[in-house]
């Protein structure tokens, strides 16, 4: 599991007495999300490494839906709209939490399962490696 | 909270009977990410909008610590390494779940959070609104 | 509700020193918000004085403000503050406390400040 | 530091008037520019960013344009509640020590 810092209450998660199972409660708390006016909305559009967004779903997953991005490119779309292939499109990946229904279909049973999604692109000079 | 679709033996979750409160197992379990053999880890650096990586910690989150990008530059960075000005680089943002503390120091109760996380930096064109 | 408070203003003496806060509801500066502190003299324009970012804990001042004035924050308690040194009769205003409109990871607070507080009186007089 | 020059810095109109209020920087900030209505006794209000882009809940007889040094923020046709002092205001930096958000003089727009 994720290490959790010492805290007065809490213990560390690597102590044999921290809780494996936990009770979660489901009420989701949008925390600063709601005060955001300018969200990445259309920058998959306006990007100069643009991607497509791509919907996983999986009923057995919290959340079932999350969107992927794909970069429309291997090179970087210039000024004047064409690509240049000197430049790479690559998409920036995160790792997130979700909960996965474990034993399958139980309703309130989960375990915290770590996936990699991407979240977007951006446009990187390409390594060369030089042959001695 | 987050609709489940509906499953055998899952009712949705605007359901009167779905659980709020849920058990979850903390050993992670990761899916995908050991097989991933390129990380976005120099990406910060080689982008045309670079970023730096912060870390936010919080002893009442699970997880405790996640890193935060943050554009270097407002503009993008050109082949010649100056900055070019006309562009934007923009922080590629994504709302992820967290596990908060509820009641605070609580050590096997918590609740679901949301919260807006920026991944990277993407380099976009400008919006530029002509007036009629 | 999304508001900032500002507190702490008052009357002190030339040469003094005065803390301001800023108190922030319905929105957690967990992440990057940009919060700035701007002031207004009586029936003049606004400066501003330099903001901080809550993520990294960054500060920008104005050239004016370096020095002698000092943006801290405590994320714990969503706050920021003002602190203002060597005080003196040009610098009673009106100080306002406000956040900047792009949230997360954005170079600099560039895109305007779409929330302020009400503001809070200094004076400094003898 | 980059100076912002506004102008006028008073101006007198009536309701349905286009109204134009201009601002100058002393050097190139691109883009980076916001523009505020302040109120007697009250917080200013963000009305503009990044010089044209309107902000959420402004009326669409605002408008902002401009690029580099010299911006103009344009009331296509006055209405009451618009008599207020407006400001201009740069959002430019390269590094922390080089980062301006400068405001403009200000312009009270009265009735004529």
């Known amino acids: 599991g994720i290490a959790i810092p010492r805290n007065s209450g809490c213990p560390n998660s690597e102590d044999k007495n921290f809780p494996r199972t936990v009770m979660v409660n489901l009420n989701i708390h949008n925390r600063n999300t709601s005060t955001n006016p300018k969200r990445s909305s259309d920058y998959y559009n306006r990007s100069t490494s643009p991607w497509n967004l791509h919907r996983n779903e999986d009923p057995e997953r919290y959340p079932s839906v999350i969107w992927e991005a794909k970069c429309r490119h291997l090179g970087c779309v210039k000024a004047d709209g064409n690509v240049d292939y000197h430049m790479n499109s690559v998409p920036i990946q995160q790792e997130i939490l979700v909960l996965r229904r474990e034993p399958r279909h139980c309703p309130n049973s989960f375990r915290l399962e770590k996936i990699l999604v991407s979240v977007g692109c951006t446009c990187v000079t390409p390594i060369v490696h030089h042959v001695a | 909270g987050i609709a489940i679709p509906r499953n055998s033996g899952c009712p949705n979750s605007e359901d009167k009977n779905f659980p709020r409160t849920v058990m979850v197992n903390l050993n992670i379990h990761n899916r995908n990410t050991s097989t991933n053999p390129k990380r976005s880890s120099d990406y910060y650096n080689r982008s045309t909008s670079p970023w730096n990586l912060h870390r936010n910690e919080d002893p009442e989150r699970y997880p405790s610590v996640i890193w935060e990008a943050k554009c270097r530059h407002l503009g993008c960075v050109k082949a010649d390494g100056n900055v070019d000005y006309h562009m934007n680089s923009v922080p590629i943002q994504q709302e992820i779940l967290v596990l908060r503390r509820e009641p605070r120091h609580c050590p096997n109760s918590f609740r679901l959070e949301k919260i807006l996380v920026s991944v990277g930096c993407t380099c976009v064109t400008p919006i530029v609104h002509h007036v009629a | 509700e999304v508001q900032l408070v500002e507190s702490g203003g008052g009357l002190v003496q030339p040469g003094g020193s005065l803390t301001l806060s800023c108190a922030a509801s319905?929105?957690?500066?967990?992440?990057?918000?940009?919060m700035c502190w701007v002031r207004q003299a009586p029936g003049k324009g606004l400066e501003w004085i330099g903001c901080?970012?809550?993520?990294?804990?960054?500060?920008y001042y104005a050239s004016w403000a370096k020095g002698r004035f000092t943006i801290s924050r405590d994320n714990s308690k969503n706050t920021v503050y003002l602190q203002m040194n060597s005080l003196r009769a040009e610098d009673t205003a009106v100080y306002y406390c406000?956040?900047?409109?792009?949230?997360?990871?954005?170079?600099?607070?560039?895109?305007?400040?779409?929330?302020w507080g009400p503001g809070t009186l200094v004076t400094v007089s003898s | 530091d980059i100076q912002m020059t506004q102008s006028p810095s008073s101006l007198s109109a009536s309701v349905g008037d286009r109204v134009t209020i201009t601002c100058q920087a002393s050097?190139?900030?691109?883009?980076?520019l916001s523009w505020y209505q302040q109120k007697p006794g009250k917080a200013p209000k963000l009305l503009i960013y990044?010089?044209?882009t309107l902000t959420s809940g402004v009326p669409s007889r605002f408008s902002g344009s401009g690029s580099g040094t010299d911006f103009t923020l344009t009331i296509s046709s006055l209405q009451p509640e618009d008599f207020a002092t407006y400001y201009c205001?740069?959002?430019?930096?390269?590094?922390?020590?080089?980062?301006?958000?400068?405001f403009g003089g200000g312009t009270k727009l009265t009735v004529l």
């Open positions: 990044l010089a044209s």
């Open positions: 050097e190139s900030i691109y883009r980076y």
């Open positions: 901080i970012d809550t993520g990294d804990g960054t500060t």
């Open positions: 205001q740069s959002n430019f930096g390269t590094a922390s020590t080089t980062y301006y958000n400068t």
């Open positions: 319905g929105f957690s500066f967990s992440g990057f918000y940009y």
């Open positions: 406000a956040r900047d409109a792009a949230y997360g990871g954005y170079a600099y607070p560039a895109h305007g400040m779409d929330l």
